[in-house]
């Protein structure tokens, strides 16, 4: 049998064998373009696409729709993987989205959706997403139903106020919703009574900015 | 820093009146909105009110439709709740809360839910006896 050579995910790494985390080489869908990502091969069994992290500040993430479109930062630290990649992965298989937060005192909550996709550019990477469970609240900080993507350059908001502007990140934002992971970072003892801060509403509350954040996906099937 | 601070609870007999009022300090918008919210004994926060610096834009629910009335002052940064006709099941801690000019486009108006609002007071008691 010929060794797969090219992965749409990194679930598909991991079934080849390759089960060590990090930064792996994945292929778009009926293409031979490439993006890199990082591959977390440790929670919950393995072969996740990191989509998304932030961890320290060290990347700005007030970015235009062209970069959130085809990716930016490190896939070893903070990153966004990119929504054309991943609206056309999602697009093709049913993918399940976990979000993995911590907070500034030691916590760690996780927020799990059975059924996530984002529909193509013509429709503003919209969010969809069904079918949540986990610890980081009963009620999806992700607006339901999704609301399409926007940035500092592209309103797409239900807001008069341009939620990108006002609250910093690209993020599928409503008018402007209980979710940004995509805000400015604050640093510890800074990162109270923030209203443009990495919010998660339905797991601490107004004001508060998240010390870590993880988006990752699996095929629901994995 | 940012501050919120009400006032004007107290006891009142049903069927009277009282005003609340919200002072509210170091806000890093140029256009906000501020709400009021209350919470009875053993109930959910709820949404009474809001007003948006900008324009005056107002909401009220439904509960409170036509006996409370929300309004400005600017030049004093503060608002008020003018709640006429009060009635027991009004009885609860209320709070004034700020956000960002988050104006919906769909219904022109300022927003009831809770997770809009970056800032809250500490609170002010209203009770209503029978």
């Known amino acids: 049998k010929e060794e797969q050579t090219t992965f749409r995910d990194c679930a598909e790494i991991f079934k080849s064998g390759l089960t060590t985390s990090g930064i792996y080489t994945l292929t778009f869908p009926n293409s031979t373009e490439e993006i890199k990502a990082y591959c977390d091969m440790d929670v919950g069994g393995g072969g996740w696409t990191v989509i998304q992290h932030r961890e320290d500040g060290s990347v700005d993430f007030q970015r235009t729709w062209k970069e959130y479109k085809e990716g930016f930062g490190s896939p070893l630290g903070e990153y966004w993987l990119g929504n054309e990649f991943v609206s056309q992965l999602t697009g093709q298989h049913r993918y399940v989205l976990k979000i993995q937060l911590k907070d500034w005192e030691g916590n760690e909550a996780h927020s799990l959706y059975d059924h996530f996709y984002l529909a193509g550019e013509e429709s503003n990477y919209r969010i969809h997403l069904t079918g949540l469970t986990g610890t980081a609240g009963k009620i999806s900080s992700i607006s339901q139903p999704g609301s399409d993507f926007s940035t500092k350059d592209s309103d797409n908001d239900k807001c008069i106020c341009k939620c990108s502007q006002m609250l910093s990140g690209g993020w599928w934002f409503d008018a402007c919703g209980p979710s940004n992971l995509n805000g400015q970072y604050y640093p510890q003892k800074q990162n109270t009574n923030k209203f443009n801060g990495i919010k998660w509403y339905y797991w601490k509350g107004s004001g508060y900015s998240l010390k870590a954040t993880t988006m990752m996906i699996r095929p629901a099937d994995f | 820093e940012v501050q919120l601070v009400e006032s004007g609870g107290g006891l009142v007999q049903a069927g009277g009146s009282l005003r609340l009022s919200c002072a509210v300090s170091?806000?890093?918008?140029?256009?906000?909105?501020i709400g009021w919210f209350r919470q009875a004994p053993g109930k959910e926060r709820e949404g009474v009110s809001c007003i948006s610096s900008s324009d005056g834009s107002t909401y009220y629910a439904d509960s409170v439709k036509g006996r409370f009335t929300i309004s400005s002052d600017n030049a004093k940064n503060t608002v008020y709740l003018q709640m006429n006709s009060l009635k027991p099941e009004d009885t609860a801690a209320y709070y004034c809360a700020a956000g960002g000019p988050r104006i919906n486009i769909a219904t022109m108006t300022c927003s009831h839910d809770e997770y809009e609002y970056d800032y809250w007071g500490q609170g002010t008691q209203v009770t209503v006896s029978s």
């Open positions: 170091g806000l890093p918008f140029d256009d906000y909105v």
